[in-house]
């Protein structure tokens, strides 16, 4: 049967009436009406967008939407004691401070509840001292200081610039090198592309401009005082001193005009190459302290800020499916913002709220999907992904025994060169043959394919003629949903050209500058890149709730394992004496994946041949590709990092918005040279191969005939 | 039983080439990514190169990055070294390794003018 004779709906509902009813004009005027007003988590402007939403929603055509509320560990600056960083004198007095606000852009003059830039969760303290620059305080930027350069950061205040790493990472990093505050900043060379203005002129940050975050170090545990739990009413929560991932020093960011001051004066040790120098007018002095005639002089951090149990709200729209109603696809955005969220998260949300538009039309004219789309507009993303973990905790036994797949929908764009995809290998087959249907937005690409504008502007560096996709890291809402629960889950986004532009993210991202206009005015006037990205999102969603087969590939995880395998190997050989020495053997894990790859191509023949009348069989073979993700998963979770279990994914250790393969071996073997212990490393390295080629060889075995 | 036998090593003079060669039985050749190991007189063992499983991904040292090419031809169950360039500190006893702890006896190459 056909997927419109299954679900007992005529022939013009299917994808293509869906994606034929996606509009690039309602787009534009859902992202105009989420961006008016902040929606910073926790207040009520975005309780009240909550509401808004779920009364959207039903009117939409859902069949029930209902809020979530969790009561989670938020952070807010204090009111009237603002946070801000000096410049002081040897008697104590403040010489330099930097600002308290952003100057905010035109037309936004007097809106209220604009909060100041703030690192969420750093505690309260007043420290001073010297300063060091710590280029992007990366644990190789660490590295370097500490053992070639002898610097010592320990009682020191250290000033990091943003950029390719998750700023949590920065944090955790200076915490272990022993310093006692840091500074957070946004350098020109980073987040100011040559050629463009700065806003509200183009799409440049400004001198005053700067990104908020939180800083946590979370590890997928979610609501720091309840991990593994919900938080909710008759939640034991543990006290603030035993809570998860909170920093230990006072942290706060700045923008480049007040690093500028900061920076200027710094003394000490000259940068140990090029890449320790970004593009401002100083000469990027390690330090430690500032130079001959300010020696003196010292830094202060004034951190006042409050961690808070505060209530969130998820939206959850539900469309049960028609024939398969115990099996679910999730899409899934956040809704709440730093300030007024212009890209991230309401580029994202617009688009989620057109599509759950478009499905409510079809259902209005009598259709529904073969299987449940549950939606959700998630709370507390900024925080720590906390409303889609909650949920997900308060749901986990449903979510393991039903979720087929999740779907990610924070911001549609982060540029409007080239589409960007991060997705399980068992989504490949689906985004490569969805984007072939549908048309390109970008210029030069008229009349043809997403995938052909796609393939040319970001190929593949393995696989010539197919673009690239990526791995799954972390810093997003998917997170609990793969990493913890090993559900199917992908992203799809536009994006920058990453060869010419080599700031990191966009440069007004948490900032107050992200409003509509910046979106409307620099980088999508006419929404046609939102419109491709609905379609993209929105594509896969139908395919995975209406596809009588799922369309996963196992074959293509196969492929990927093997690249793994090579790529794991190869740096554990890079210690050729220590592997023989500790004889330690990759054979059970090339043979896993050998019987993986044989495993997964008999299972793909079968897939092509059986039955698909008979509803028993089909539902047996759909239930070994669903339960496919589900068995990379180990219960007893990564070292240190019990609530990320998936075995050939984790979020990297060193930068959690970057994904790492086969991450228990890796993390093992990482600066091996350095343990103390070289026999316990070594047989730590070879515990993680086994447990690698046990999940893989377990997972080749639910390919299996089942009997 | 795993067997690896490399051979292809002798005496060269500096900027001369050789081509390495491991001949492999015993295993399923194409399912494992396969390392040339090196061990410099009176050093230790110096990881030189690996080669993914399909004819896959190739990584280097970088002291012979550029100089050396590592490949495969799983039809014949051979793993070759192609050594160009060659410096005196690239004398040493060569080695194929499998996995991690099957290794074979080791070729000698010797670099001198």
């Known amino acids: 049967k056909s997927s419109n004779e299954a679900t007992n709906i005529t022939p013009k509902h299917n994808m293509k009436a869906f994606l034929d009813e996606l509009k690039a004009e309602n787009i534009k005027k859902f992202l105009y009406n989420f961006t008016q007003i902040p929606h910073l988590a926790g207040t009520e402007q975005n309780f009240q967008l909550a509401k808004q939403i779920q009364s959207q929603w039903k009117e939409f055509g859902l069949d029930s939407v209902e809020l979530a509320h969790y009561d989670v560990l938020l952070s807010y600056p204090n009111k009237t004691h603002p946070n801000y960083i000096s410049i002081i004198n040897e008697d104590g007095n403040e010489i330099f401070n930097t600002s308290l606000f952003e100057p905010p852009p035109p037309g936004y003059e007097n809106v209220s509840d604009i909060v100041p830039p703030f690192s969420a969760f750093s505690p309260q303290g007043m420290p001073e001292g010297d300063l060091v620059y710590v280029n992007y305080a990366r644990t190789e930027d660490f590295f370097k200081l500490e053992r070639d350069m002898k610097i010592n950061c320990s009682g020191k205040i250290v000033i990091a610039r943003y950029g390719k790493v998750f700023r949590g990472n920065k944090v955790k990093n200076a915490q272990l090198a022993g310093a006692k505050g840091v500074i957070l900043y946004s350098d020109p060379a980073d987040y100011f592309a040559p050629g463009v203005k700065s806003y509200p002129d183009g799409w440049n940050l400004p001198g005053g401009g700067v990104q908020r975050g939180n800083i946590l170090n979370l590890n997928g545990a979610g609501d720091p005082l309840t991990p593994g739990y919900p938080a909710n009413e008759y939640a034991y929560r543990r006290g603030i001193a035993e809570a998860v991932g909170l920093p230990s020093i006072p942290v706060h960011p700045i923008g480049y005009y007040d690093a500028q001051k900061l920076l200027e004066k710094m003394g000490g040790s000259a940068p140990p190459d090029s890449s320790w120098r970004g593009s401002l007018k100083v000469p990027y002095n390690v330090g430690p302290g500032f130079t001959g005639n300010f020696s003196t002089q010292k830094v202060k951090m004034h951190i006042h800020s409050t961690n808070e149990v505060t209530r969130i709200y998820n939206v959850i729209g539900t469309l049960r499916g028609a024939v398969e109603p115990d099996r679910y696809v999730i899409l899934g955005g956040h809704r709440d913002s730093w300030v007024f969220g212009g890209i991230d998260p309401q580029s994202g949300a617009a688009v989620v709220h057109e599509i759950v538009r478009s499905f409510g039309t079809l259902k209005k004219e009598g259709w529904r999907p073969r299987r449940t789309i549950l939606f959700a507009s998630w709370d507390a993303e900024e925080f720590g992904l906390l409303g889609s973990t909650e949920w997900a905790e308060e749901n986990s036994r449903l979510l393991q025994e039903r979720g087929v797949a999740y779907i990610n929908a924070d911001s549609s764009i982060e540029g409007n060169y080239t589409l960007r995809v991060d997705c399980t290998p068992l989504m490949y087959s689906l985004v490569h043959n969805l984007t072939k249907e549908l048309k390109s937005p970008d210029e030069g690409f008229e009349g043809k394919s997403l995938y052909e504008s796609w393939t040319k502007k970001s190929p593949s560096p393995e696989f010539s003629g197919m673009p690239r996709i990526s791995k799954l890291g972390s810093g997003n809402d998917f997170e609990v949903f793969f990493q913890r629960l090993g559900i199917a889950s992908g992203r799809a986004r536009y994006t920058k050209n990453w060869e010419t532009n080599k700031f990191s993210g966009y440069p007004l991202y948490h900032s107050v500058y992200e409003t509509y206009e910046l979106v409307e005015k620099f980088y999508d006037p006419m929404f046609k890149y939102h419109l491709t990205v609905a379609q993209v999102r929105g594509g896969m969603v139908f395919e995975l709730a209406n596809s009588i087969v799922l369309p996963f590939d196992c074959r293509d995880y196969a492929v990927v394992l093997r690249k793994y395998a090579d790529k794991i190997y190869s740096i554990s050989m890079k210690h050729p004496q220590e592997m023989k020495t500790y004889s330690v053997s990759f054979d059970s894990l090339f043979s896993a994946v050998k019987n993986f790859t044989e495993i997964a191509s008999k299972f793909s023949e079968r897939l092509q041949d059986f039955d698909k009348s008979n509803p028993i069989v089909l539902r047996m073979m759909n239930d070994q590709l669903m339960f496919l993700e589900r068995a990379f998963i180990d219960p007893l979770g990564l070292p240190d990092r019990p609530f990320y279990r998936h075995v050939i994914y984790a979020p990297s250790s060193h930068n959690k918005y970057a994904g790492e393969s086969f991450p228990g071996i890796y993390d093992a073997l990482f600066d091996i040279e350095s343990k103390v212990d070289p026999s316990k490393a070594w047989g730590e390295v070879k515990r993680q191969i086994y447990v690698a080629a046990f999940t893989v060889q377990a997972a080749a075995e639910t390919l299996s005939e089942v009997a | 039983e795993v067997q690896l036998l490399e051979s292809g090593g002798g005496l060269v003079q500096p900027g001369g080439s050789l081509r390495l060669s491991c001949a492999a039985s015993?295993?399923?050749?194409?399912?494992?990514?396969l390392s040339w190991v090196r061990q410099a007189p009176g050093k230790g063992l110096e990881w030189v190169s690996s080669?993914?499983?399909?004819?896959?991904?190739?990584d280097y040292a970088d002291n012979v990055k550029g100089r050396f090419t590592i490949s495969r031809d799983n039809s014949k169950n051979t793993l070759y070294l192609q050594m160009n360039s060659l410096r005196v500190e690239d004398t040493a006893v060569y080695y194929c390794?499998?996995?991690?702890?099957?290794w074979g006896q080791g070729t000698l190459v010797t670099v001198s003018s």
């Open positions: 015993g295993f399923s050749f194409s399912s494992y990514a």
């Open positions: 080669i993914g499983e399909n004819d896959g991904t190739t």
């Open positions: 390794v499998k996995d991690g702890v099957h």
